[in-house]
Structure formats: structure tokens, C-alpha cells
Interface confidence: low
């Protein structure tokens, strides 16, 4: 008995071939011997089966001795043994129809779980293997679960159902709702304008929700809400903003915040959360601000950084075009009695400069000693 696998909602074509390459009488029946369709001369006739309005054949093939049964908009309950009677012969075809669906919305938040459920006909024992867009294979029986979805899981999941050594393939598009970056760090000199951007890793027709940026300044004992906002059809409107600092927010996506001045008291870490309408859970993006200040006070040239710097970062003070005078894995370095010239304060990681601030040291004129 030939086995054919079909997909719920699809169309399947069951073949039936006569040895004579001409149009002869044929009938398709189900396992209960109920006629589905056949021919009467060059006309298609239909029987009283439940498939009536979904069954068809290809009359253009009859002259070649081919009498297919076409079933449209397949249902799981169409799974059956179909019998083609032609030339006093019976050809049996077992049709097994499967369906694969995501048990929830196909738009899921990063970190959530995806469950795929297989609908299968009674008596079948299929196995399912799914391959995620990043190439991860998962397998199971009637259900497959993937916990902790990641951004790379966005895209087309290819699932193969195996039954009787036959395969049928399903493709399910999954959108993982997340920010493009989980974390970012901005390095700024004191006084510079700071731009924070929070691009989303997905696009949807309508995007509605609300968000907030909480900020933990390095110098502060507790975090505070810097700004809250609403998102309606991709339009951003500010609900509440602190007076210090007074952030500005762009009116369109991507979410964009401007801090007028980078100051040591603002250096620290923030967490932008975005709650989307009709979704449980929130999207998160961490943002870090490192601020540098170079100052000269009397005979002391000092360079300091504030904010979340790694212990492997190097802070250096050097006179332009000369070797570094001081270079330490510290958040503050200084030079006593610096010579005149343009000094550079550098924050670097493995030789790559992350932040640079220049300060000019003027010559000090000593009073001539009287003879």
C-alpha cells in the first residue's frame, strides 16, 4: 500500500494509472467503500462522500490513462485509505494528513518559550524534527518545546514530520521580539551631548506599548526613573521626565534619547524596558554611560572616568606625540607639575582607544630672582 503524507490546509494529488493510455471508467472510494468521484464518459461524477466539495480530478490527464484524486484544503480527518478502481484493479493509497501549529502567537518575546504542536491522525506514530534559523535541531513527538528563545531564533523554522519513512515539511515563521542589542556602552567626555539609541530587531505593522528608562548612577545610592513614554502605532509620546537630567526623546522609532550633557553624576547604567500591548513580559536593553574629565588644578593634572568600566581598561595621561607619562588600570590618574603642551587622557581597551580628552597646559613663568 502506497503511503502519501499531506499537510493540513494544503492540496494533495493521489495518483491512479491504468495500463491503457486512454480514458476509461474509474472510481475513487474511501475505506468505507463510499464513492468520492469517478467518470461517466468525459464527465466527472461525484459521490456522497464528505469530500464532495473538496474533491476533484484532472480531466486533461484521463486520455493518458491517469485518473488522479485531488483533495483541496486538507483536514486531519481526511486521513484514510483511498481506493482507485480501474480496469478491474484496485489501487490503494493511504493518506496521512498532519498539521503543525505554534500553540501561541508566532510573535514571542525574547526569553519566552515556543511550543509547536503536531496534529496527527489516529493510529499514526510520527516523529518531528525542527531546525531553527540558527541551525539548532530539536526533536519530539506530538509537541516540541524550545525555552528561552533568542534573537537568532527569529525566522523560518523548518520542521519535518517523519512517518512510514516518508517526510513532510512545515515552515513556520517565528518573530522574536527583542532589541537589536542586549547591552550597549557609550563613552563621552564631560559636557558632550549623549545619544542613546534602542533599535528593535523586528518590524511589525502596528506597535503599541509603554516604556521606561531606569537609571542607576554610579554616585547614587538608588536608581531612579529618568523618563516614561507611550508608543502608539510607532509614534512616541513622553509621559513623564525628570528635571535633572532633562532627557529629550525622538517622536518616531527607533527609540532615541538625548542627554544634553555628559556629567560625572550621570555616569552609570540604565535599563530601558518596553511593555508591548497584548504581550506578557517586557523587552529590555541595558545602556551604560562612561564619562571622562580632564582637569588641571594648580600643579596637578588629573584624568578621571566615571561609570561602568572594566578592570582590564587602561587609563593613560600622555603629552602629545610622547610616551604615556602615567598608565594605570584605575579610574583616575594624575601627573604632578606637568610640562607645557597638549596633554591627552586616553581610556583604552587592549590598545584600542575608547575615549580621549585633550587639555592644554600653559607654561608657568617664574619670577626672576633678584641679584
Amino acid at each position: 500500500k502506497k503511503v502519501v503524507l499531506g499537510k493540513k490546509g494544503d492540496t494533495v494529488e493521489l495518483t491512479c494509472t491504468a495500463s491503457q493510455k486512454k480514458s476509461i471508467q474509474f472510481h475513487w472510494k474511501n475505506s468505507n467503500q463510499i464513492k468520492i468521484l469517478g467518470n461517466q464518459g468525459s464527465f466527472l461524477t461525484k459521490g456522497p462522500s464528505k469530500l464532495n466539495d473538496r474533491a476533484d480530478s484532472r480531466r486533461s490527464l484521463w486520455d493518458q490513462g491517469n485518473f488522479p484524486l485531488i483533495i483541496k484544503n486538507l483536514k486531519i480527518e481526511d486521513s484514510d485509505t483511498y481506493i482507485c478502481e480501474v480496469e478491474d484493479q484496485k489501487e490503494e493509497v493511504q493518506l496521512l494528513v498532519f498539521g503543525l501549529t505554534a500553540n501561541s502567537d508566532t510573535h514571542l518575546l525574547q526569553g519566552q518559550s515556543l511550543t509547536l504542536t503536531l496534529e496527527s491522525p489516529p493510529g499514526s506514530s510520527p516523529s518531528v524534527q525542527c531546525r531553527s534559523p540558527r541551525g539548532k535541531n530539536i526533536q519530539g513527538g506530538k509537541t516540541l518545546s524550545v525555552s528561552q528563545l533568542e534573537l537568532q531564533d527569529s525566522g523560518t523554522w523548518t520542521c519535518t514530520v517523519l512517518q512510514n519513512q516518508k517526510k513532510v515539511e512545515f515552515k513556520i515563521d517565528i518573530v522574536v521580539l527583542a532589541f537589536q542589542k542586549a547591552s550597549s556602552i557609550v563613552y563621552k567626555k564631560e559636557g558632550e551631548q549623549v545619544e542613546f539609541s534602542f533599535p528593535l530587531a523586528f518590524t511589525v505593522e502596528k506597535l503599541t506599548g509603554s516604556g521606561e528608562l531606569w537609571w542607576q548612577a554610579e554616585r547614587a545610592s538608588s536608581s531612579k526613573s529618568w523618563i516614561t513614554f507611550d508608543l502608539k502605532n510607532k509614534e512616541v509620546s513622553v509621559k513623564r521626565v525628570t528635571q535633572d537630567p532633562k532627557l529629550q526623546m525622538g517622536k518616531k522609532l527607533p527609540l532615541h534619547l538625548t542627554l544634553p550633557q555628559a556629567l560625572p553624576q550621570y555616569a552609570g547604567s540604565g535599563n530601558l524596558t518596553l511593555a508591548l500591548e497584548a504581550k506578557t513580559g517586557k523587552l529590555h536593553q541595558e545602556v551604560n554611560l562612561v564619562v571622562m574629565r580632564a582637569t588641571q588644578l594648580q600643579k596637578n593634572l588629573t584624568c578621571e572616568v566615571w561609570g561602568p568600566t572594566s578592570p582590564k581598561l587602561m587609563l593613560s595621561l600622555k603629552l602629545e606625540n610622547k610616551e604615556a607619562k602615567v598608565s594605570k588600570r584605575e579610574k583616575a590618574v594624575w601627573v604632578l607639575n606637568p610640562e607645557a603642551g597638549m596633554w591627552q587622557c586616553l581610556l583604552s581597551d587592549s590598545g584600542q582607544v575608547l575615549l580621549e580628552s585633550n587639555i592644554k597646559v600653559l607654561p608657568t613663568w617664574s619670577t626672576p630672582v633678584q641679584p
Epitope: S127, Q129, R131, P133, R134, G135, N137, Q139, G140, Q152, S154, G155, T156, T158, C159, T160, K167, E169, K171
Partner: antibody, heavy 118, light 113 residues
């Protein structure tokens, strides 16, 4: 039945880069990942990495991290594999293969011979 | 990475006789939840790309003659050519695809005695 057609043989000097193309025809380009496998003269098969032409996602073997880059052009149904900082031991036949849903390779390109010689 | 070791390195068999190639993996490639062995066998003739013969350790790929069969489970696998034909002269490779990176055996050369 999908077919994979690769670009022609290349001769390169040590330190140079090579970019091999793999064009899919006769099937849906984005349905399967494409893996790259190389074979040095008289040697066995070595997996280099894969790319999902649909999403652009890639995964590289640790040995080739930093030297290999896989890209795709969906408009021409072509996947590219670029290997940089070539050395003599990179002399090999480079194959692209359709990475089946399970991870076996039912369809292979004809292979591209890359010779690295000073 | 999983290491695949084939034996023997080469094999000479008379036409019509049985040829057996073994493949051992450094760790199991059997998925217990799926009850499938993630192992494939390939045939490679000179100047040609490899050709998939067997997947899931024992399932013949489309168009592969039934004289080729695969068996084994866990870490030990066998490719059998029940009656060697002249066109079967080639190098045969096993490959695991249970984990990334997928890895191949070193190959077994089959010749006619």
C-alpha cells in the same frame, strides 16, 4: 531537485583571500542551510561552517573563526564563502552542500579547487 | 568535537562479495528522545563530490541501490555492500550530525580484489 553550481578554480598567493560562490537552482533557495566542506589533496572531509540563506545566520567551525565569512545574495540565490589569510595548507577542494533538515548533505556542489602557492 | 574513526583504512573485495566498513564515534550519536542515530554514510569517487548513501544510520537515500545497507547504534556503526559491483569502487565516509560541528571519519577506500 535543487542543484548547486560553484565558481571555477582559483590560484592564490599566501596571505591573500579567496571568495567561492555557490548558486542554487531548481528549488527554493531559502529552504535549506548551506554548509561548506573542504577536502585537502588525498585527505578527508572537513566542515567549515554553514549559512542559512533565509535569515543570513551563520555558524563557523572554531578552527576557521576569524578567517571565514559566509554571505549570501538572495536576488541571485547565491551563497559565498570567503577565506582570508590563505596559507599553503588551505589548498583544497571546497564544496558547498545543502544541509538537510537533519544535518546530512543530500546535494553537493561540484567543488572548487583552491590552490595556495607562492 | 566528536571524533569519528573508520576501519579499515582500505579494503579489497572480490566482485559479488560482501564489503563491510566500520565507524566508531567518540561519544554516542543516538538521540534517546527521538530514537534516531545521527549518522550518515557517503560515497566519493575520484574527482566527484561525496554522494549521500545512508542517513539516520540505516535509511537509504533516494536512488541508492539496496545492496547498500547501514546498521548500528550509539557509537558503533557499519556500512555493508552486500554484493560489490565495479561501480562501487570509491572512498566511503561516515559523518555524525548529532552535534555541531558535524565531523567525518577519515575515509575507507574500497577496491576490487
Amino acid at each position: 531537485q535543487v542543484q548547486l553550481v560553484q565558481s571555477g578554480a582559483e590560484v592564490k598567493k599566501p596571505g591573500a583571500s579567496v571568495k567561492v560562490s555557490c548558486k542554487a537552482s531548481g528549488g527554493t533557495f531559502s529552504n535549506y542551510a548551506i554548509s561548506w566542506v573542504r577536502q585537502a589533496p588525498g585527505q578527508g572531509l572537513e566542515w567549515m561552517g554553514w549559512m542559512n540563506p533565509n535569515s543570513g545566520n551563520t555558524g563557523y567551525a572554531q578552527k576557521f573563526q576569524g578567517r571565514v565569512t559566509m554571505t549570501r545574495d538572495t536576488s541571485t540565490s547565491t551563497v559565498y564563502m570567503e577565506l582570508s589569510s590563505l596559507r599553503s595548507e588551505d589548498t583544497a577542494v571546497y564544496y558547498c552542500a545543502r544541509d538537510d533538515d537533519y544535518g546530512d548533505y543530500p546535494v553537493w556542489g561540484q567543488g572548487t579547487t583552491v590552490t595556495v602557492s607562492s | 568535537d566528536i571524533v569519528m574513526t573508520q576501519s579499515p583504512d582500505s579494503l579489497a573485495v572480490s566482485l559479488g562479495e560482501r564489503a563491510t566498513i566500520n565507524c566508531k564515534s567518540s561519544q554516542s550519536v543516538l538521540s534517546t528522545s527521538y530514537n534516531k542515530n545521527y549518522l550518515a554514510w557517503y560515497q566519493q569517487k575520484p574527482g566527484q563530490p561525496p554522494k549521500l548513501l545512508i542517513y539516520w544510520a540505516s535509511t537509504r537515500a533516494s536512488g541508492v541501490p539496496d545492496r547498500f545497507s547501514g546498521s548500528g547504534s550509539g557509537t558503533d556503526f557499519t556500512l555493508t555492500i552486500s554484493s560489490l559491483q565495479a561501480e562501487d569502487v570509491a572512498v566511503y565516509y561516515c559523518q555524525q550530525y548529532y552535534t555541531t560541528p558535524p565531523t567525518f571519519g577519515q575515509g575507507t577506500k574500497v577496491e576490487i580484489k
